[in-house]
């Protein structure tokens, strides 16, 4: 029954890029400007996504496919299909509701996005700090103190407890 009905439905013959126009005896009409239909048999065309402001156009809208956006430089995409744009920060910073803020001592961020994370605590693995951490880089752990030659010493500062900087509070 469904198959028979679809064969009799004139709208099923309307290809992508058109819509079945009820105002014109169900004739297949092209999608109006700034709209599209990605499948056949549609009774309306969808409005094209507009990429403006924080968004910029990655792919123009066509009669058969929606526009695709990415973010204006200085921001990066979040969410499926770049549904949001979020501010970039510098390495050594994290984004808060107050804007980009430097990582607290004992934490680092080596990217333009994301939160500051605590330096690795080398002593938990029985190792020593070979290279100190910075706001932009994690510590580099070296051999365990027992592996060092006699007389050599190494200090491993503990990673400080902290609240996650990405918290809105």
């Amino acid at each position: 029954f469904e198959r028979t009905r679809s064969l009799q439905d004139p709208c099923s013959n309307c290809p992508a890029g058109t819509f079945c126009d009820n105002n014109r005896n169900q004739i297949c009409s092209p999608c109006p400007p700034n709209s599209f239909s990605s499948a056949g048999g549609q009774r309306t065309c969808d409005i094209c996504r507009q990429c403006k402001g924080v968004f910029r156009t990655r792919k123009e809208c066509s009669s058969t496919s929606n526009a695709e956006c990415d973010c204006t430089p200085g921001f990066h995409c979040l969410g499926a299909g770049c549904s949001m744009c979020e501010q970039d920060c510098k390495q050594g910073q994290e984004l808060t509701k107050k804007g980009c803020k430097d990582c607290c001592f004992g934490t680092f961020n080596d990217q333009k996005r994301g939160i500051c994370r605590p330096w690795t605590n080398c002593s938990l693995d029985g190792k020593s700090v070979l290279v100190n951490g910075t706001k932009e880089r994690d510590v580099v752990c070296g051999p365990s103190p027992a592996d060092l030659s006699p007389g050599a010493s190494s200090v491993t500062p503990p990673a400080p407890a902290r609240e996650p900087g990405h918290s809105p509070q």
């Epitope: 979040l78 969410g79 549904s83 949001m84 744009c85 979020e86 808060t96 509701k97």
Partner: nanobody, 123 residues
Amino acid sequence: EVQLVESGGGLVQPGGSLRLSCAATGFTLSNYWMNWVRQAPGKGLEWVANINQDGSERYYVDSVKGRFTISRDNAKNSLYLQMNSLRAEDTAVYYCARGGEGYGVDHYGLDVSGQGTTVTVSS
């Protein structure tokens, strides 16, 4: 349709003032954090200020602190940016932008913005 429309830009002399407005349609402004961002000629996009749903929290980029004031009138579905002591480096296209669902909790993403209004500071 969800839309933001900015207005109030123009040419102003250094030291002068301007008030930008942003009219929101298609959604209830009082449910969202709102932001102003700007793009100077040849530069990337820069966040300027934000304000929470009821206006009790407001934050600014360091370069505009003490000079710019963000405000909102939820009854009029409008956002504002009062800009005083304008400098040449404030020359930019200014956009109003809505914080997406969950803004300030697990992200700081902006999901809707307008076409922008141009501010030129020059003598």
